[in-house]
Amino acid sequence: DAHKSEVAHRFKDLGEENFKALVLIAFAQYLQQCPFEDHVKLVNEVTEFAKTCVADESAENCDKSLHTLFGDKLCTVATLRETYGEMADCCAKQEPERNECFLQHKDDNPNLPRLVRPEVDVMCTAFHDNEETFLKKYLYEIARRHPYFYAPELLFFAKRYKAAFTECCQAADKAACLLPKLDELRDEGKASSAKQRLKCASLQKFGERAFKAWAVARLSQRFPKAEFAEVSKLVTDLTKVHTECCHGDLLECADDRADLAKYICENQDSISSKLKECCEKPLLEKSHCIAEVENDEMPADLPSLAADFVESKDVCKNYAEAKDVFLGMFLYEYARRHPDYSVVLLLRLAKTYETTLEKCCAAADPHECYAKVFDEFKPLVEEPQNLIKQNCELFEQLGEYKFQNALLVRYTKKVPQVSTPTLVEVSRNLGKVGSKCCKHPEAKRMPCAEDYLSVVLNQLCVLHEKTPVSDRVTKCCTESLVNRRPCFSALEVDETYVPKEFNAETFTFHADICTLSEKERQIKKQTALVELVKHKPKATKEQLKAVMDDFAAFVEKCCKADDKETCFAEEGKKLVAASQAALGL
């Protein structure tokens, strides 16, 4: 349905509060270095303009597209050239090229200071002094650091952020009330950002078909009682929502997501029995709840798939008539029967089935050729099962920190060219799979673990894409979305790597380490471990363990010393010498 004024349409659909919040998110995700005040000014100008269009849709410029209006506004920023360099060249382009240009300049790892959490009393005062500015600042800071954050979901986070301050700033012990809530929001926010980043990478790097396949598999697991036609409709709508959000069309995305939630709730009887509670919630909570809803029970009586997909004489006829529909049905039928498989495994099985049909439907005797197609599934299923079993055993034996260290060593040896901060961040996140997934029963382990690993490895891929340093990473990241994890798992030690020169400065520590939180101290130690492996890639586990144990003892000893700085200086020299000797450097 065409509207005379798109901006007026979205303003009316979303309401002023959501409109302003979404425009702020959009601008902060595009111009990540701009000061908060500049963004607020731009948002206010856009909002005032939108209001004039609501009053009269025929008013001047109200018929312009949102990309044109927003792009024109962003291009009025005076310091664009000096702050963003070549991104300023985007402003010389016309839509839609200008928006594509802005999208290409989104930075997954912007050079922004770490967010430091002020004292609780300081935060509560700021919250009470100006609640609106305080919440806008939250949206701005998250959006600029996470330029692909799912905007309607960020509104949900902001709502929870506000609720936490409203409740806790009145509590007797403000800190005890607030800090755990903020920690939870931070951790959930990072996870949400990473999950959305994978969706956008899937759409942008591998195309709509790849995303739709992922969505068919996931929604079929979640809604196994829904008909294929219903799942297909949901997949189409969901693809539109994520295409819009990943493309910077945040107003349309939020509006369409609300429509999708409405549709799901109006049709829950034909979708899932698990939606009742979600559908009683307000909009933001409802959409979040639907996105996280547990899998419905499988229908009581699902036949074997062999009849339709192997034994039927019409397999090649059905495939030829509508390849993607037939493959979609295969994926739907397999996924609804297999909530115990990861989505990426289901997609590998579907790809194997597709490849077999492509080959066999051109053969002399197609049926004879594809009769044994599912024998090819067995190794594909067993590989992640075995990998998860081995790694969960290792995790249970070592605990999270040491399990992360094992992964740090493993991945540094595979791709030593990758920057140390990236290796530390990615390996720490890979290591979290243990506490996240190994506690689950076997039927839930694989979807938990392998789909989580896909999200984490995508972080490695997008960070590496910014400054590519390893052909092996590029190869694993670009060849196949669903085979990224097996590709990285299969990498052995990089024999072509020339060890890094030893630099004593890398292993010089100071008394400030003593005041760090346990997590930050772990990161320091893990950074040192990566550097050790880069210096001595052939070091054995035993050698590395000995050096790390010495390092831990050194930190503990000097943090207890009266003159900490002297201790770090003197004992540090001894430690470096001992480590060099132990590793034969």
Epitope: D301, L302, P303, S304, R337, H338, F374, F377, K378, A443
Partner: nanobody, 124 residues
Framework: EVQLVESGGGVVQPGGSLRLSCAAS????????MGWFRRAPGKEREFVAA????????YYADSVKGRFTISRDNSKKTAYLQMNSLRPEDTALYYC?????????????????WGQGTLVTVSS
Amino acid sequence: EVQLVESGGGVVQPGGSLRLSCAASGSNISSYVMGWFRRAPGKEREFVAAISRSGGYTYYADSVKGRFTISRDNSKKTAYLQMNSLRPEDTALYYCAAGRYSAWYSQSYEYDYWGQGTLVTVSS
């Protein structure tokens, strides 16, 4: 957790019949596809028959179609394999299996729980 115990095996002449039973304890078997597999001496384990959760769908290996019938009684937590017109090549150790998420009924890796087996010998 499901424990499966097969019974009903024995020695029978060619052309004879046997009825195998698979009794489950632990979980309710109505959530599981039930299957029968067999392993003949010196051979790989092979699929025989399977039945969907409520019993509405059955699926057979070509070699037993028309001779064997699989059934189940969820209230008794038991699956059955009625074997008629038995042949010497049906001689094998017969295993019962339960699969929570089976899509391909004939694939052994899609079954989560297995019994110890019951021996069927067809000989004159």
